[in-house]
């Protein structure tokens, strides 16, 4: 014969535990039903009657199967520098996260108490370690051959652009300037060419501007594409 299924409340066998989603009530000395997430125990069980559950009131919650007499209060509304990533419902607490450009400087078990702005690396410095939800940006000086010309919490040090002929060598806060146009990004005709940044993986030596055989009239102005020609000269 199949074993009979015990209905709550019931007295457990000596040495055994209550089943999943049940708890042992010390007063009644019975295995009783837990309340589901979003509910709480309105009336505790007795030897003859099971737990009576009731829904959590507004702005309160229970996240787990439980037998608590009152639901937990949701945290206070998110502050102005935070965004609500999870709303307060009967089954979950409100979660506040720092808005973009900020990180959590003081974390609590249910979210963030204090947001702080991410550090911005000034020109000549790049991001060595990006900011996360809970950690600030770490800046580092741009190594020789690399630069950052922005004040930014995301920009890394990037390599100076390659020039056919260098007009102004780059430094930690400025890209190299080429005498001949280097339209490495597509440009509209007539647009002034500004040196375009690349990134961190180069090693250069840049003492002085180099002598140029290029005509100075083409300085930083885009040229139309010209195919390789026999005996072609510089820009």
């Amino acid at each position: 014969l199949p074993a009979q299924v015990a209905f709550t409340p019931y007295a457990p066998e000596p040495g055994s535990t209550c089943r999943l989603r049940e708890y042992y009530d010390q007063t009644a000395q019975m295995c009783c039903s837990k309340c589901s997430p979003g509910q709480h125990a309105k009336v505790f069980c007795t030897k003859t009657s099971d737990t009576v559950c009731d829904s959590c009131e507004d702005s309160t919650y229970t996240q787990l199967w439980n037998w608590v007499p009152e639901c937990l209060s949701c945290g206070s509304r998110c502050s102005s520098d935070q965004v609500e990533t999870q709303a307060c419902t009967r089954e979950q607490n409100r979660i506040c996260a720092c808005e973009a450009g900020r990180y959590c400087a003081l974390k609590t078990h249910s979210g963030c108490r204090l947001c702080a702005p991410l550090r911005k690396c000034r020109p000549g410095f790049g991001v060595a370690r990006p900011g996360t939800e809970t950690s600030d940006v770490v800046c580092k000086p741009c190594a020789p051959g690399t630069f950052s010309n922005t004040t930014s919490s995301t920009d890394i040090c990037r390599p100076h652009q390659i020039c056919n002929v260098v007009a102004i060598p780059g430094n930690a806060s400025m890209d190299a300037v080429c005498t001949s146009t280097s339209p490495t990004r597509s440009m509209a005709p007539g647009a002034v060419h500004l040196p375009q940044p690349v990134s961190t993986r180069s090693q250069h030596t840049q003492p002085t501007p180099e002598p140029s055989t290029a005509p100075s009239t083409s300085f930083l102005l885009p040229m139309g594409p010209s195919p390789p020609a026999e005996g072609s000269t510089g820009d």
Partner: antibody
């Protein structure tokens, strides 16, 4: 006619050194960035290093940084690549290439290549 | 693993049109950098085929054309000939590297 002619390749033991040369003609050598590009046997192309026309600025791939040195002698129209602390993975055909007119990030002329074999 | 992605192989019969793709990212092609194409015939050095996305050097037949859109580019060869059998490489500048980056190469086979 633009011509680029590499030399100096050969067999070398791991940890050894080699110096490649590239003789250029047919264009105003000092007005252009020059590059070294390599191709391991049966593999694709890999940019190695570059140097600006006036030789003031050099550029390296991570894989060779600190081991290879690019240089040029504009009076001799010659490009060089000094390769030290060579490894088996440096085995490749090494091409010298001329930076494009107005844009040194493409190569409008290439040499025929010189084979470097790093093996014990 | 190449920064730019190309199909390892492509094929076509004489007279056909074939297209070879080159897919990059927001740090290279998508950043607005020009795409260049090289042809490497068996046992020879690479040769510039297309520069600045769609420009042909003198001496390159107009059967070869290039285009670029978004984070990808393509090389089209129309009126395929047996002498077009070669490896084709795309290349572009990349915000994350000091020199140009190449695709892994596409081996084009002319059938028949």
């Amino acid at each position: 006619e633009v011509q680029l002619l590499e030399s100096g390749g050969g067999l070398v033991q791991p940890g050894g050194s080699l110096r490649l040369s590239c003789a250029a003609s047919g264009f105003t050598f000092s007005s252009y960035a020059m590059h070294w590009v390599r191709q391991a046997p049966g593999k694709g192309l890999e940019w190695v290093s570059a140097i600006s026309g006036g030789a003031t600025t050099t550029y390296y791939a991570d894989s060779v940084k600190g081991r290879f040195t690019i240089s040029r002698d504009n009076s001799k129209n010659t490009l060089y690549l000094q390769m030290n602390s060579l490894r088996a993975e440096d085995t490749a055909v090494y091409y010298c290439a001329k930076g494009g007119t107005g844009d040194p990030y493409y190569f409008d002329y290439w040499g025929q290549g010189t084979l470097v074999t790093v093996s014990s | 693993q190449s920064v730019l992605t190309q199909p390892p192989s492509a094929s076509g019969t004489p007279g056909q049109r074939v297209t070879i793709s080159c897919t990059g990212s927001s740090s290279n092609i998508g950043a607005g950098y020009d795409v260049h194409w090289y042809q490497q015939l068996p046992g020879t050095a690479p040769k510039l085929l297309i520069y600045r996305n769609n420009q042909r050097p003198s001496g390159v037949p107009d059967r070869f054309s290039g285009s670029k859109s978004g984070t990808s580019a393509s090389l089209a060869i129309s009126g395929l000939r047996s002498e077009d059998e070669a490896d084709y490489y795309c290349a572009a500048r990349d915000d994350g590297l000091s020199g140009p980056v190449f695709g892994g190469g596409t081996k084009l086979t002319v059938l028949g």
